[in-house]
């Protein structure tokens, strides 16, 4: 089948890094600078991705593979193939339209990216809060109140601030 196809279509002989040049009797021509073909039999070469602005080059373009970008310091990749760079925030913050914003009461973010998440609801597992949560850290759940030895006590989380929608644990 391959042999038949190559007899019918001379372009199928053109390897990656080349293209089948219709203007030159369908001979295989190398991809021009700043372009590539990652598979054989291509009739055109694709333009190399350029990593500009907040993007920086992680891997240079070659005749057979596209350039790969990542983000400059203070930003991180989002989307397939790092299609976007998003601003880093500090731990205890999340990104909003206006920029980095502290996590609302009852939520935390222990990373420089992503969104604030609620503190763990210890009572779901029949446990109590051993260490209170902060903007940067989740609560630490401990043994259930019944499991505590006499005289020992668990930390009671502070009453929630008037943050709309927060459900105390």
């Amino acid at each position: 089948f391959e042999r038949t196809r190559s007899l019918q279509d001379p372009c199928s002989n053109c390897p990656a890094g080349t293209f089948c040049d219709n203007n030159r009797n369908q001979i295989c021509s190398p991809c021009p600078p700043n372009s590539f073909s990652s598979a054989g039999g291509q009739r055109t070469c694709d333009i190399c991705r350029q990593c500009k602005g907040v993007f920086r080059t992680r891997k240079e373009c070659s005749s057979t593979s596209n350039a790969e970008c990542d983000c400059t310091p203070g930003f991180h990749c989002l989307g397939a193939g790092c299609s976007m760079c998003e601003q880093d925030c500090k731990q205890g913050q999340e990104l909003t339209k206006k920029g980095c914003k502290d996590c609302c009461f009852g939520t935390f973010n222990d990373q420089k990216r992503g969104i604030c998440r609620p503190w763990t609801n210890c009572s779901l597992d029949g446990k109590s809060v051993l260490v209170n949560g902060t903007k940067e850290r989740d609560v630490v759940c401990g043994p259930s109140p019944a499991d505590l030895s006499p005289g020992a006590s668990s930390v009671t989380p502070p009453a929630p601030a008037r943050e709309p929608g927060h459900s105390p644990q």
Partner: antibody, heavy 121, light 112 residues
Framework: EVQLVQSGAEVKKPGSSVKVSCKAS????????IYWVRQAPGQGLEWIGN????????FYGEKFMGRATFTADTSTSTAYMELSSLRSEDTAVYYC??????????????WGQGTLVTVSS | DVQLTQSPSSLSASVGDRVTITCKLN????????VHWYQQKPGKAPKTMIY?????PDGVPSRFSGSGDSSSNSAFLTISSLQPEDFATYYC??????????FGQGTKVEIK
Amino acid sequence: EVQLVQSGAEVKKPGSSVKVSCKASGYTFTSYYIYWVRQAPGQGLEWIGNIWPGNGGTFYGEKFMGRATFTADTSTSTAYMELSSLRSEDTAVYYCARRPDYSGDDYFDYWGQGTLVTVSS
Amino acid sequence: DVQLTQSPSSLSASVGDRVTITCKLNSGNIGSYYVHWYQQKPGKAPKTMIYRDDKRPDGVPSRFSGSGDSSSNSAFLTISSLQPEDFATYYCHSYDSTITPVFGQGTKVEIK
């Protein structure tokens, strides 16, 4: 493909409870908020609350505090909303929706098909 | 509490008309949080038409656009040339805090 598939319509008596399920597929269930929103007949959208399935953390709208309960079963990637002490004003279509993790004020990118809950004596 | 007021609450327009829906924030700053727009048809779940103020999801026609104006503390959804499939109810959505979403009351776009 991301999908949120909700349980079927329910008819309930005043004073009873209803539990609506929302089965997620096509993404990591524990890494996105699930929001619950309702819509009374001919009315607009109203936020009930939300859950982070990763740890069961919840937030409730003031109007629904003490009456709504959200849970999540990570083994089946299913979120649940239970509403108790039902009254006729709770007759509505109840939606679950996913919020992306891009920013804290992001949109709802996927919605369930909705569950009609009718409260009638 | 933050409220979003949409205007008009309903409008009648013809195919080909340019239509603009306004979503006004009663307090706070329209620049603080993103505004999103959903289209809803009877018996269906809302569908995102515009997200993060002015971005269009894949598959949403280019006749839909979003914008904002800080002086009037408002966001706008514009349909440049109304098509038969655009007759629906449109909702704006933003936030009171990053936990608490708020919605406009909806604008019904009807055929004249």
